[in-house]
């Protein structure tokens, strides 16, 4: 079998959901000494980066300008050290948002419920879409999907304090083209005093996987980056559409 280098890690900087006409930035974290990085879109070459000097950085950032539906889809990257190529990274799904219209999100029986109550979110959009998506802030990888002509429902079942947080929904025109986000709906779940006080609150920052951890080479940083690359490859989870 042909020898290959370890696969790089591909990430979206900040978020994989990019408003149309805004810039997306994808990071490909490979190896110190890589002389070339390639970004592929839907299996075809999209961009090439040849860092100079190559030994100083363990990855590159690819800017994707003017986001639109033609640039939304599945990206991957590879890198080369000398004449040796890496395996292909996992696929990253890049989504364009703020397409066409804005849905309305509501919750039944209401935004304030007690632990154990059954809750259902309703997302409504009066334009031609049949797929709806519900996201919880700080958990943008955990997308719930539902189908309906102009409205979809998202039954949550009996909720716990872990369900507390801010939710938004989108209408989806295809897997990679989403509407404007709805206005957020904040779900407040009250339980007994002990549970409520101990329940962790969700972070409002994006997923920790959506950050670029590129480092310049120093002795310590090289060790940390190697550890980070190994750990991330081991634990990396990716949402597939």
């Amino acid at each position: 079998p042909k020898q290959t280098l370890p696969k790089p890690i591909i990430r979206a900087e900040s978020t994989y959901m990019v408003p149309k006409e805004k810039q997306a930035t994808l990071c490909c974290q490979g190896s110190y000494g890589a002389v070339e990085y390639q970004l592929h879109f839907e299996g075809s070459l999209f961009a090439v980066e040849r860092p100079k000097p190559p030994e100083r950085i363990n990855g590159v950032k690819f800017h994707i300008p003017d986001m639109n539906s033609r640039k939304a889809g599945r990206y991957s990257c590879i890198y080369r050290v000398g004449e040796l190529w890496s395996e292909r990274s996992d696929l990253l799904d890049l989504v364009v948002t703020e397409m066409y219209d804005t849905p309305t999100l509501s919750v039944h029986p209401g935004p304030e419920v007690t632990s154990g109550e059954k809750v259902t979110f309703y997302c409504r959009l009066d334009t031609a879409t049949s797929m709806f998506l519900l996201l919880k802030e700080g958990r943008s990888r955990d997308v719930q999907r539902s189908y309906g002509k102009v409205q979809a429902e998202f039954p949550m079942g009996p909720v716990t304090t872990a369900h507390r947080g801010s939710y938004r929904c989108f209408g989806s025109y295809n897997n990679y083209a989403w509407s404007f986000p709805s206005e957020p709906v904040k779900l407040l779940v009250t339980g007994d005093i002990e549970n409520t006080s101990l329940a962790p609150t969700d972070p409002t920052f994006p997923d920790s996987w959506d950050t670029c951890l590129l480092t310049r080479e120093t002795g310590l940083q090289k060790d940390l980056a190697l550890w980070d690359h190994t750990a991330q490859n081991h634990h990396h989870h990716h949402h597939h559409h």
């Epitope: 810039q23 075809s44 070459l45 961009a47 590159v60 950032k61 800017h63 994707i64 300008p65 003017d66």
Partner: nanobody, 130 residues
Framework: DVQLVESGGGLVQAGDSLRLSCAVS????????MGWFRQGPGKDREFVAA????????YYADSVKGRFFISRDNAKNTAYLQMNNLRLEDTAVYYC???????????????????????WGQGTLVTVSS
């Protein structure tokens, strides 16, 4: 608005050389990655060559590697495509293109996908005869 104007096309014999120029106005040319594409008769548009804004990275389609050379003069807001040892299959309309946005692009990045480019010239016809 951005204008890209190609020139230098024409009718040549197989084995001859030709140099295409692409004059850009309306944007900060010196910070834009650039590319050349072509569309032959009855064919899809295909990537030919690309160059980073600093000229430090160039990239070529396999079919033109070793024969075509892309360059740029940021002082003149112009990109060039030097085409040597032309073949019959190089007959096409050649387009230059500039990557969109107003980003601080890396000095070493090139874009090979047509969808990455926002602004296009009107094209110049290159015909190679035997």
């Amino acid at each position: 608005d951005v204008q890209l104007v190609e020139s230098g096309g024409g009718l040549v014999q197989a084995g001859d050389s030709l140099r295409l120029s692409c004059a850009v106005s309306g944007r900060t040319f010196s910070r834009l990655p650039m590319g050349w594409f072509r569309q032959g008769p009855g064919k899809d548009r295909e990537f030919v060559a690309a160059i980073s804004w600093s000229s430090s990275t160039t990239y070529y389609a396999d079919s033109v590697k070793g024969r075509f050379f892309i360059s740029r003069d940021n002082a003149k807001n112009t990109a060039y495509l030097q085409m040597n040892n032309l073949r019959l299959e190089d007959t096409a309309v050649y387009y230059c293109a500039a990557v969109g946005g107003s980003l601080d692009y890396s000095a070493t990045v090139v874009y090979t996908a047509a969808r990455a480019y926002a602004d296009w010239g009107q094209g110049t016809l290159v015909t190679v005869s035997s």
